[in-house]
Each structure stands twice: as structure tokens, then as C-alpha cells.
């Protein structure tokens, strides 16, 4: 009888099924929806999380309109195809054979087409801008305190290496967090900025993906930081390919 058997859950992903049937009774966890093995010492990929979210029973699902994106992703939630490593497949299709290409965070980056649509590679999202507006406070937050607290959050809660938090901007009431991570910068074991941003987005909405942890309690020098609006912009290493018709609509 081991400690793993007493608490066989996944600390970093509550959307899992776990059982103590690994070596020496260790806890082995699989993502809902895909059944894929999950590493509970780090963040789960956004693709597997979306798949798990779509597989959850309708009455257990919290329907929240997704953020607006730089790529104007108004498609909402979808049930994605993930590769064996849990990343988004470059081409996604729905049940009616409508297909489109996505970037590494699963956001559509082309017009929709049919099954003949080709998506040659998964284009990496290398720059994410998280744009927040906080609720009114007695005064503005101190910029350096705010900067330090948000960097600490991404380092400790999401395990994102500090070098990938490029900047924190603040003009009351708007806070902007810039995450940057080129393909060449991302080493094995590094948390992906897309996954960190998704966990943060869900935390901000009060839908934490962490097992048994309380919701996100953001404080700057003891003062609660309450977010009332979130926009996330994704920039890809290769610009998206939309027709002019869409751009002028």
C-alpha cells in the first residue's frame, strides 16, 4: 500500500482518470476523452484539455464563451484531433467534413475548406499577448509589484520558465502580459506558452484545471487583483492565411 494509492489523482489536471496500476503501485493518469497518458508533474497540453472538455457530460460542462483572439477565432469550442504527443494536428475537421488549419494553440489560421484542404505543418504560435482589464481599485497597482507577482504566478503555478515571460505592461486598468517562445528556445521539458496561457485563461474564468487547488487568488501587496475582461492575441511564426473576403467583412 503506497502513498500513490492513497491519493491517486493528477495535481495538474482534474480532467483525468487515474489508477494505481503503474510500477510499484504508482498512480497512472489518462486524459478524459483521448485516454492518453498524462504527465502530472507538468501542465497537460491544451489539445488534450479541449478534448477532455468536449467529452465531459453536458450537464457537467461549464459553457463559457471563449476569448476573442487576434485571429478572430469565433468558432468556439471544438473537439480537436491531437497527435500522439498531445499536440494539435495541423488540420482539424468537424463531423460534416469541413476542415481548417490551426496553429500550435489550436486557433484557426485559414479559411474553412473541405477534406481536400492541406495543412502542411503545425505553425508555432511564438508570441502570446494576454490583455486583461482589472476591476476598479482605490488606486493603481504599483507596476513593479504587479510585474513581480505575475511573473511569480507563471513561474510557480504554471511552471513556465521566467525567460518566456517577455514583459508585463500596465496602464490602469489594462494589464498586458507578453509571452514569447520560439521553436529554437523551447527545450525538452519546457512548458509551452500556449498551455500556460490556457491554464491562466481558465484560472481567470474561475474554471481552474488544477486538482483540488483553490481558485486563483491574485494579490498585489495584499490587494486583490480581480479581472473583469480577458482578451488573448496569438501571433504565429508564419502569418495566417485568410482570404480578403474575410478580412473586409
Amino acid at each position: 500500500h503506497t502513498a500513490a494509492q492513497d491519493n491517486c489523482t493528477c495535481p495538474t489536471n482534474k480532467m483525468t482518470v487515474c489508477s494505481p496500476d503503474g510500477p510499484g503501485g504508482r498512480c497512472q493518469c489518462r486524459a478524459l476523452g483521448s485516454g492518453m497518458a498524462v504527465d502530472c508533474s507538468t501542465l497537460t497540453s491544451k489539445c488534450l484539455l479541449l478534448k477532455a472538455r468536449m467529452s465531459a457530460p453536458k450537464n457537467a460542462r461549464t459553457l463559457v464563451r471563449p476569448s476573442e483572439h487576434a485571429l478572430v477565432d469565433n468558432d468556439g469550442l471544438y473537439d480537436p484531433d491531437c497527435d500522439p504527443e498531445g499536440r494539435f494536428k495541423a488540420r482539424q475537421c468537424n463531423q460534416t467534413s469541413v476542415c481548417w488549419c490551426v496553429n500550435s494553440v489550436g486557433v484557426r489560421r485559414t479559411d474553412k475548406g473541405d477534406l481536400s484542404l492541406r495543412c502542411d505543418e503545425l505553425v508555432r504560435t511564438h508570441h502570446i499577448l494576454i490583455d486583461l482589464r482589472h476591476r476598479p481599485t482605490a488606486g493603481a497597482f504599483n507596476h513593479s509589484d504587479l510585474d513581480a507577482e505575475l511573473r511569480r504566478l507563471f513561474r510557480e503555478r504554471y511552471r513556465l520558465h521566467p525567460k518566456f515571460v517577455a514583459a508585463v505592461h500596465y496602464e490602469q486598468p489594462t494589464i498586458q502580459i507578453e509571452l514569447r517562445q520560439n521553436t529554437s528556445q523551447k527545450a525538452a521539458g519546457d512548458v509551452d506558452i500556449g498551455d500556460a496561457a490556457y491554464y491562466f485563461e481558465r484560472d481567470i474564468k474561475g474554471e481552474s484545471l488544477f486538482q483540488g487547488r483553490g481558485g486563483l487568488d491574485l494579490r498585489v501587496r495584499g490587494e486583490p487583483l480581480q479581472v473583469e475582461r480577458t482578451l488573448i492575441y496569438y501571433l504565429d511564426e508564419i502569418p495566417p492565411k485568410f482570404s480578403m473576403k474575410r478580412l473586409t467583412a
Epitope: A3, A4, C10, G22, P23, G24, R26, D39, C40, E85
Partner: nanobody
Framework: QVQLQESGGGLVQPGGSLRLSCAAS????????MSWVRQAPGKQREWVSY????????YYADTVKGRFTISRDNSKNTLYLQMNSLRAEDTAVYRC??????????????WGQGTMVTVSS
């Protein structure tokens, strides 16, 4: 990139033996924990055996304990599974996997394509 290539599978009679090999490349094999997993037709993949990076610690699923032996040769970047006293219920696709073991959790992150083992008279 990580590559794992299994070999040694085949058709064997109940009570017989097979030795599976797994050639690894694309990562520092000598510092990686490894496992063998298997998947029988229509069943979920199950963990079979685990070995730590230097070969000093091994674990076996109850279903194969005493019959299977996992080993590795870090100088050849190769993982092995010696299977004795084979039974019909051992029939499955066997895959080697890179693994990670903590005090409480176990996970595999890369798998080979697999080699088929059929135990039948």
C-alpha cells in the same frame, strides 16, 4: 527526434520463449527510464515492465512477474524483454516506451510502433 524500434516478436507455442529488443535514438538513453507496455486486440494498453536508467531497479506487472525479465544495454542504446513460459493471454502488440517515475506517479511519453507477439498452438 525520439525514435524507438522494437523487434523480436513472432508466433510462439504456449510455454515457449521470446526475446524482444528495442533500439533507441534521438535522446540520452542512458539517463532515461524505460518500460515495456502491451496492447491486446480490443483491450486497453497495459504496462508490463519498467527499468530505471542505470538498470538497478525493475518492476513487473503481476500478470508477468516471475516469467518476464527486463534489461538494458546502455552502451548499445537497447532495451530488452526476455519472455518465458508464454501463455495465450500474453498475445499482444508489445511496445517499448520512454518512462518517468516519481514517488507517486508514473507516465510514458514516447512509444515505438510495436512488435506483435502471438502465443498459439
Amino acid at each position: 527526434q525520439v525514435q524507438l524500434q522494437e523487434s523480436g516478436g513472432g508466433l510462439v507455442q504456449p510455454g515457449g520463449s521470446l526475446r524482444l529488443s528495442c533500439a533507441a535514438s534521438g535522446f540520452p538513453f542512458s539517463s532515461a527510464d524505460m518500460s515495456w507496455v502491451r496492447q491486446a486486440p480490443g483491450k486497453q494498453r497495459e504496462w508490463v515492465s519498467y527499468i530505471n536508467a542505470d538498470g538497478s531497479k525493475t518492476y513487473y506487472a503481476d500478470t508477468v512477474k516471475g516469467r518476464f525479465t527486463i534489461s538494458r544495454d546502455n552502451s548499445k542504446n537497447t532495451l530488452y524483454l526476455q519472455m518465458n513460459s508464454l501463455r495465450a493471454e500474453d498475445t499482444a502488440v508489445y511496445r517499448c516506451a520512454r518512462a518517468k517515475l516519481t514517488d507517486t506517479h508514473y507516465v510514458e511519453d514516447y512509444w515505438g510502433q510495436g512488435t506483435m507477439v502471438t502465443v498459439s498452438s
